[in-house]
């Protein structure tokens, strides 16, 4: 196997790799730096691994993973050394790393010439108390948003930032806006961006008006 | 209104684990804010220690974070701090606080607002 | 880290007086992240101001904030006896969240 890559997203996580297996099986293993390797997906034809149950676990550590290959009938086949072959994944950490899947506004009111913005606060696969976190439980403040926000008659842009998952702006009487958002973890070196949310504009059914 | 109480021993031991509680009183801990812990060393300015959300994500000093655990329990409406290998260095008044979120600019930044009295903590053998 | 140094480290002034304290950051900080708090002998911080200008609930309109990027003022107008404390300038935007070393205001 070759090309291990990572396809995280609100860490629902998924090892892929080549070639599409002609004779040969997979199996995966996965561990964190300290820990013991896990194996799942056993003797698979697929080429690729969920791996989010493992590594929702625990999102700050650091994950590697491992790719077996085992001919098609013979799964003792091993290498030169005696192992069987594999290959290792590039290093993983969720926290750091897992995409930030596109937001959703959740809903919009105006109440004169304010409008509160609310943004979904979507849910994760991570758990805690048997409970599912959503996105803001677990990262916290470290996890901003953006909003663009622009009157329906032109292009000009304004954008607003906040710590939770609600806006409160100021618009011009009379006028219509669209909104879009942006999730956004300013501490991160990598995937620190969300792609846009769908825009959304006053005058249609997520929105509330209000003297 | 919400009240902050700091709770634990004054007088610890070098290389021991310093634990302070935090009980939050006129409010629910699972309400939105964050909650943090602050020290302030004899004479001296203020300290950041972490804060905790009441999910338990957490942040940390990380001149602090390898000996520094926070953590939350929400059924006592408590948030602890655990500070291990303790020096004379840790030797300072401990203050809990909560975080919460004020309209700024069109959207919404977490300050610290509401502060336990503080306690003082002496590590000395 | 950012750091946040204050000045001047004492301020000597009689109750009446305008006092303007400064606060300069190593680096930019987002007004949004700027906050001020006041501290009395035996007391906690008491938090003042928010967003580098807004003044916190209950707090008297004689203290104002002002300033951008690297370097904020705390303004109190008019000194009134209850004023005389140390006060200290933080950020909250970037982790270590980093208070100013304070300025003390005393009665000259």
């Known amino acids: 196997a070759f090309n291990l890559t990572w396809i995280s997203t609100d860490f629902k996580t998924i090892l892929e790799w080549q070639p599409k297996p002609t004779n040969y099986t997979y199996t995966v293993q996965i561990s964190t730096k300290s820990g013991d390797w896990k194996s799942k997906c056993f003797y698979t034809t697929d080429t690729e691994c969920d791996l989010t149950d493992e590594i929702v676990k625990d999102v700050k550590q650091t994950y590697l993973a491992r790719v077996f290959s085992y001919p098609a009938g013979n799964v003792e086949s091993t290498g030169s050394a005696g192992e069987p072959l594999y290959e290792n994944s590039p290093e993983f950490t969720p926290y750091l790393e897992t995409n930030l899947g596109q937001p959703t506004i959740q809903s919009f009111e105006q109440v004169g010439t304010k409008v509160n913005v609310t943004v979904e606060d979507e849910r994760t696969l991570v758990r805690r108390n048997n409970t599912f976190l959503s996105l803001r439980d677990v990262f916290g403040k470290d996890l901003i948003y953006t909003l663009y926000y622009w009157k329906s008659s032109s292009s000009g842009k304004k954008t607003a930032k906040t710590n939770t998952n609600e806006f409160l702006i100021d618009v011009d009487k009379g006028e219509n806006y669209c909104f879009s958002v942006q999730a956004v973890i300013p501490s991160r070196t990598v995937n620190r961006k969300s792609t846009d949310s769908p825009v959304e504009c006053m005058g249609q059914e997520k929105g509330e008006f209000r003297e | 209104q919400v009240q902050l109480q700091e709770s634990g021993p004054g007088l610890v031991k070098p290389s021991q684990t310093l634990s302070l509680t935090c009980t939050v009183s006129g409010g629910s801990i699972s309400s939105g804010q964050y909650w943090s812990w602050i020290r302030q060393h004899p004479g001296k300015g203020l300290e950041w220690i972490g804060e905790i959300y009441y999910s338990g994500s957490t942040r940390y000093n990380p001149s602090l974070k390898s000996r520094v655990t926070i953590s939350v329990d929400t059924s006592k409406n408590q948030f602890s701090l655990k500070l291990s290998s303790v020096t004379a260095a840790d030797t300072a008044v401990y203050y809990c606080a909560r975080d919460t979120p004020y309209y700024y600019d069109g959207g919404y930044y977490y300050y610290m607002d509401v502060w336990g009295k503080g306690t003082t903590v002496t590590v000395s053998s | 880290e950012i750091v946040l140094t204050q000045s001047p480290g004492t301020l000597s002034l009689s109750p009446g007086e305008r006092a303007t304290l400064s606060c300069r950051a190593s680096q930019s900080v987002s007004s949004s992240y700027l906050a001020w708090y006041q501290q009395k002998p035996g007391q906690a911080p008491r938090l003042l101001i928010y967003?580098?200008?807004s003044r916190a609930t209950g707090i008297p309109d004689r203290f104002s904030g002002s300033g951008s990027g690297t370097d904020f003022t705390l303004t109190i107008s008019r000194l009134e006896p209850e004023d005389f404390a140390v006060y200290y300038c933080?950020?909250?935007?970037?982790?270590?969240?980093?208070f100013g070393g304070g300025t003390k205001v005393e009665i000259k």
């Open positions: 933080q950020q909250v935007g970037v982790v270590p969240y980093t």
């Open positions: 967003g580098a200008s």
